[in-house]
Amino acid sequence: GSERTCCPVNWVEHERSCYWFSRSGKAWADADNYCRLEDAHLVVVTSWEEQKFVQHHIGPVNTWMGLHDQNGPWKWVDGTDYETGFKNWRPEQPDDWYGHGLGGGEDCAHFTDDGRWNDDVCQRPYRWVCETELDKASQEPPLL
């Protein structure tokens, strides 16, 4: 594939990554799939600066990120190490709350209205953010 050197139309560039901000809601798995079909992934937050950039764009709205613990431990969708990486949970979170009555606990992470993170039921239809890195090989065939 060819290297992507600029962001696609309607994506926003920041620190050598491209971001796309949804304006509708999907369940976490559907949002995850949407990003993958765009040759991207749900946003992976690795620094204060990236947190603030994303927060600036999404506003005070619940928004999915690429972090989940559906298979046990918390994992970032791109393989970034969770334990040693940036975290910005709300106080008392994550709590894997079972009291919502929807079955199971809470396995997917989202930005809350103040930007800090919460775990929630993955089926909730929240907005989402896709991210793809510039300079990575894209899956599209090169133009002839």
Epitope: W48, Q55, K87, D113, R116
Partner: antibody, heavy 119, light 107 residues
């Protein structure tokens, strides 16, 4: 109402240590990031350090890195600044400040405590 | 580190005048720019946050604008209680740096 009250300042010799405290009241202390900011006599404001609401992360200005340590005791609603290897240039009024968690500004400040480093 | 350059460093003006203070960041800080007012012997007081949002209780004669690297604090009609020193501060990236301050004095 929100109150932040610093204490522990005083005169100390170069190379010695001092611990500042900031007693918080009127809000849920454990939900907020807290900062120390200092101001040398007749000079401007200098950011010193921050600690996250749960104490899990801290960042420092280069000028104090390795010498100062920020900590907090959420059960006592108190913020601390341990200052070691003090230098003359650390002489300043030290303020603690509460950070708004959604927009990252300092919405409440203490009255300040003066630290004088002199032989 | 992000450098914050504030200008002017001081100005002499009169009650009723319009005052503009500028702050320039050495790199893009989006809108994470705050303004504080400080009077002698007192702690700083928040005026504006996220570049243009007025803190509760602050008079509407204060306004802020800008994004990216260039920001402005404006006092539309200076009042006697506004004579003070004003600081900008970026809260995008640690260390959270302040500008050098602007002292607004009576002419």
């Amino acid at each position: 109402q929100v109150q932040l009250v610093e204490s522990g300042g005083g005169v100390v010799q170069p190379g010695r240590s001092l611990r500042l405290s900031c007693a918080a009241s009127g809000f849920t202390f454990s939900s907020y990031g807290m900062h120390w900011v200092r101001q040398a006599p007749g000079k401007g404001l200098e950011w010193v350090t921050v600690i996250w609401h749960d104490g899990s992360n801290a960042y420092y200005a280069d000028s104090v890195k390795g010498r100062f340590t920020i900590s907090r005791d959420n059960s006592k609603n108190t913020l601390y600044l341990q200052m070691n290897s003090l230098r003359a240039e650390d002489t300043a009024v030290y303020y603690c400040a509460r950070e708004n968690s959604s927009s990252y500004y300092f919405d409440y400040w203490g009255q300040g405590t003066l630290v004088t480093v002199s032989s | 580190d992000i450098q914050m350059t504030q200008s002017p460093s001081s100005l002499s003006t009169s009650v009723g005048d319009r005052v503009t203070i500028t702050c320039r960041a050495s790199q893009n800080i989006i809108s994470y720019l705050n303004w504080y007012q400080q009077k002698p012997g007192k702690a700083p007081k928040l005026l504006m946050y996220v570049a243009s949002r007025l803190q509760s209780g602050v008079p509407s004669r204060f306004s802020g604008s800008g994004s990216g690297t260039d920001f402005t604090l404006t006092i539309s009609s200076l009042q006697a209680e506004d004579f003070a020193t004003y600081y900008c501060q970026q809260s995008y990236s640690t260390p959270y740096t302040f500008g050098g301050g602007t002292k607004v004095a009576i002419k």
